[in-house]
């Protein structure tokens, strides 16, 4: 097993991305700067800017996107642009989404197979259990915060007037009508896909057909495959397959090395895509603002609901999660967050946890010193099951709808909302048309009207972005916490808990490639700090 890269006082690996996506060395000062530390001399300022260039570009892109969107909206918006020009306007953003989605499948499958194969079953179980516990607790906390805020701020009472303007007949017809049981059965079915290839682009969903049985019209559930990647099924398969590969012992090592190499190549692609991200984000944000009609009117009517959601996300993301991280690691959580600003901005721009996954992996590994076998095992699981933002929004929405329709919420109903929101947000990845359908499930569980889901949909474009940011932040902090847990358990036991599979050279004698051409080779600083020792990179994900 190779030695770990040296870490600075902040516990950060002294490594920086290179052009080919490999890792080069960085001075401790550079790392301090990169992590948001103090930049003193002009030289340090230059290094600081260089280290944070992508982060700064991303932040600028979001701000520029908002400004550009508002500017175009002010000049007439989507109507003035027309469908063709609007399509061209959002194209750079669409391109980023396509690039990221292209990467998801190989990244998730390979990283999870590699990650699961690189951990001994005991460690895998412990790591998985701690991760799921963290995800569950934080989601429950987010739900509680959502309910608490909505009860305190009463967004529904404030927005009651929109009832009149929307019309009495609401739009319950548009609200998905699906049995709660069928939703969870679909979730189970998607965990075990019948066809792995189709799981890459389709998932199972139950719909209903009305049939005439002995003179009575009966609603019969009919299963069908619908468009949309079954990420839950792929995640479960990849983990189980990785464990199976490990069981094979030496026989499976070649295949493990294949998946690890595949993963590294994918990460090289990610490092290239990262530099396009700011451009894409800018146009994604701008495009969404331009597409929206009557943003002002929407804010006037649903302002308190939006405020409630965004405030909840801000409190959970900037106070609750960082506090949990600090309590367990005694490290500065905001330094950690600074390291993942690019994926957070990407999450805001793309509104997709899985699309943000490639960038998040790259950043937590390179900026926050999370080991590959942790990040590449935990992050895909987190992107699938950890949905703090979604749970919080659904709780706010449920209480908002209760207030809007003047329906009471007793203690039992509040607990039901909390539990259902937590459970359904975990399962949302396995349910096609996740967000709205899971909200409908919550409303059904407490007998609240689904008529007003249309109102929630009206501002979903904004709230969902905030949700995604919180979701991916939770995943990243979870990975950071687990890294801390692993560091502590490893320092306590002489025998390392995480057995790692080395990516050895091919069995046939082949010329050793140069570092530039081989992202599997990495240089670490020697003890003296200047001598460079070539070593084989941990091939674990």
């Amino acid at each position: 097993m190779v030695a770990d890269p040296p870490r600075d006082s902040k516990g950060l690996a002294a490594a920086e991305p290179t052009a080919n996506g490999g890792l080069a060395l960085a001075s401790i000062e550079d790392q301090g700067a990169a992590a948001g530390g103090y930049c003193g001399s002009r030289d340090q300022v230059r290094r600081c800017l260089r280290a944070n260039l992508l982060v700064l570009l991303t932040v600028v892109a979001v701000v520029a996107g908002v400004a550009l969107g508002l500017g175009v909206s002010g000049a007439g918006g989507a109507l003035a642009l027309g469908p063709e020009r609007l399509s061209a306007f959002v194209f750079p953003g669409e391109l980023l989404l396509r690039l990221l989605r292209m990467i998801i499948l190989p990244l998730v499958v390979c990283s999870l197979i590699g990650g699961a194969a690189s951990l001994d079953p005991g460690a895998l179980g412990r790591l998985g259990a701690w991760a799921l516990l963290f995800f569950l607790v934080t989601t429950l906390l987010a739900s509680a915060l959502g309910v608490g805020l909505a009860l305190a701020l009463q967004p529904g009472a404030a927005s009651a007037a929109i009832n009149a303007s929307v019309g009495a007949a609401g739009s319950a017809e548009n609200a998905p009508s699906k049995e709660v049981l069928d939703s969870f059965l679909d979730l189970a079915r998607n965990i075990f896909p019948s066809n792995l290839v189709s799981a890459a682009f389709r998932s199972y969903s139950t719909t209903y057909e009305e049939r005439n049985i002995t003179g009575t019209r009966v609603k019969v559930p009919v299963g069908q495959e619908v468009e949309g990647m079954n990420i839950l099924g792929l995640v479960v398969f990849a983990i189980v397959f990785g464990v199976a590969l490990r069981k094979l012992g030496p026989e499976g090592e070649l295949l493990i090395r294949f998946f690890n190499s595949f993963n590294e190549a994918t990460m090289v692609l990610v490092s290239w895509i990262m530099w396009y991200a700011p451009v894409g984000i800018m146009f994604l944000v701008a495009g969404k603002i331009v597409e929206m009609e009557d943003v002002g009117l929407l804010f006037a009517r649903l302002g308190k609901y939006i405020l409630c959601c965004l405030l909840g996300h801000a409190i959970h993301g900037l106070l609750v999660l960082p506090l949990i991280y600090f309590l367990f690691t005694r490290k500065n959580p905001y330094r950690f967050l600074w390291g993942i600003v690019t994926p957070l901005a990407t999450a805001f721009g793309t509104s997709s946890s899985s699309a943000t996954l490639p960038l998040m992996m790259k950043c937590v590994e390179e900026k926050n010193g999370v080991a590959k076998h942790i990040s590449r095992f935990i992050l895909p699981i987190g992107a699938t099951v950890n949905m703090d933002g979604a749970a919080l929004f659904q709780c706010v929405a449920a209480v908002f709808i209760a207030q809007l329709s003047q329906q009471s919420l007793d203690f039992v109903k509040i607990i039901t909302i909390l539990v259902t929101a937590t459970a359904s947000s975990v399962g949302a990845a396995g349910i096609p048309a996740g967000g709205v359908l899971t909200l409908a499930i919550i409303l059904e569980a407490v007998n609240l009207p689904v008529d007003h889901i249309s109102l929630i949909l009206a501002v979903d474009w904004l709230v969902d972005r905030s949700c995604t940011v919180l979701n991916v932040e939770g995943d990243a902090l979870g990975a950071g916490l687990l890294q801390n847990y692993v560091d502590r358990t490893e320092s306590r036991s002489t025998e390392p808990e995480l057995i790692q599979v080395k990516s050895e050279l091919p069995l046939d004698p082949l010329p050793v490639p140069t570092e530039e051409g081989n992202p599997l080779l990495k240089h670490y600083r020697g003890p003296a700090g200047d001598a460079t020792v070539a070593s084989e990179k941990e091939s674990v994900m």
């Epitope: 007949a169 609603k219 003047q406 329906q407 007998n447 009207p449």
Partner: antibody
Framework: QIQLVQSGPELKKPGETVKISCKAS????????MSWVKQVPGKGLKWMGW????????IYGDDFKGRFAFSLETSASTAYLQINNVKNEDTATYFC?????????????WGQGTTLTVSS | DIQMTQTTSSLSASLGDRVTISCRAS??????LNWYQRKPHGTVKLLIY???RLHSGVPSRFSGSGSGTDYSLTISNLEQEDIATYFC?????????FGGGTKLEIK
């Protein structure tokens, strides 16, 4: 006990305005929405809309937008239905009904009804 | 809007009989079906909500059942005071809609 007491019968000429009151007692007025239901003689019941008693916001059914107005006097625990420019087809019995705060849309307590007759 | 149909507009029964009044919705109303009683020139009373839940103060001889689009109200032991018109109402989505009513008479 919970009671909804409506004002007496009304006889109006077309074009006039009528205001029907519904006084609630026995519960916290602002906790439950108040609905209005119309019954034309020999016909079924038709939901007119409801008023959010906490926010004071009226919500009207599609057939009752324009001439109809719901209002409240919270301090007196009273809801009002006003019909402007009454027409012959407004001849009916109007009920106020407390909207339950559970199980979506149903009405657990009803007023005795106010008969409106529109005749020239 | 969801249409509610009570196929039987009037029904004759003897005291002590078991009477069933049916109601059909134009689409699945997921058990959000309520029953009301209106006595001649009297007030309207809620009998049953959410398909089968008895409202407070309603005698236990009244019961409700059904699912999807088909629902029914049953009076197990008809009494003189039960002579009235019975309305069903869906509370699944706005606007709430009522059936045309079933008038119950004594044979």
């Amino acid at each position: 006990q919970i009671q909804l007491v409506q004002s007496g019968p009304e006889l109006k000429k077309p074009g006039e305005t009528v205001k029907i009151s519904c006084k609630a007692s026995g519960y916290t007025f602002t906790t439950f929405g108040m609905s209005w239901v119309k019954q034309v003689p020999g016909k079924g019941l038709k939901w007119m809309g409801w008023i959010h008693t906490y926010a004071g916001v009226p919500i009207y059914g599609d057939d009752f937008k324009g001439r109809f107005a719901f209002s409240l006097e919270t301090s007196a625990s009273t809801a009002y239905l006003q019909i402007n420019n009454v027409k012959n087809e407004d001849t009916a019995t109007y009920f106020c009904a407390r909207r339950s705060d559970n199980y979506r849309y149903f009405f657990d307590y009803w007023g005795q009804g106010t008969t409106l007759t529109v005749s020239s | 809007d969801i249409q509610m149909t009570q196929t039987t507009s009037s029904l004759s029964a003897s005291l002590g009989d078991r009477v069933t009044i049916s109601c059909r919705a134009s689409q699945d109303i997921r058990n959000y079906l309520n029953w009301y009683q209106r006595k001649p020139h009297g007030t309207v009373k809620l009998l049953i909500y959410y398909t089968s839940r008895l409202h407070s103060g309603v005698p236990s001889r009244f019961s409700g059942s059904g699912s999807g689009t088909d629902y029914s109200l049953t009076i197990s032991n008809l009494e003189q005071e039960d002579i009235a018109t019975y309305f069903c109402q869906q509370g699944h989505t706005l606007p709430p809609t009522f059936g045309g009513g079933t008038k119950l008479e004594i044979k």
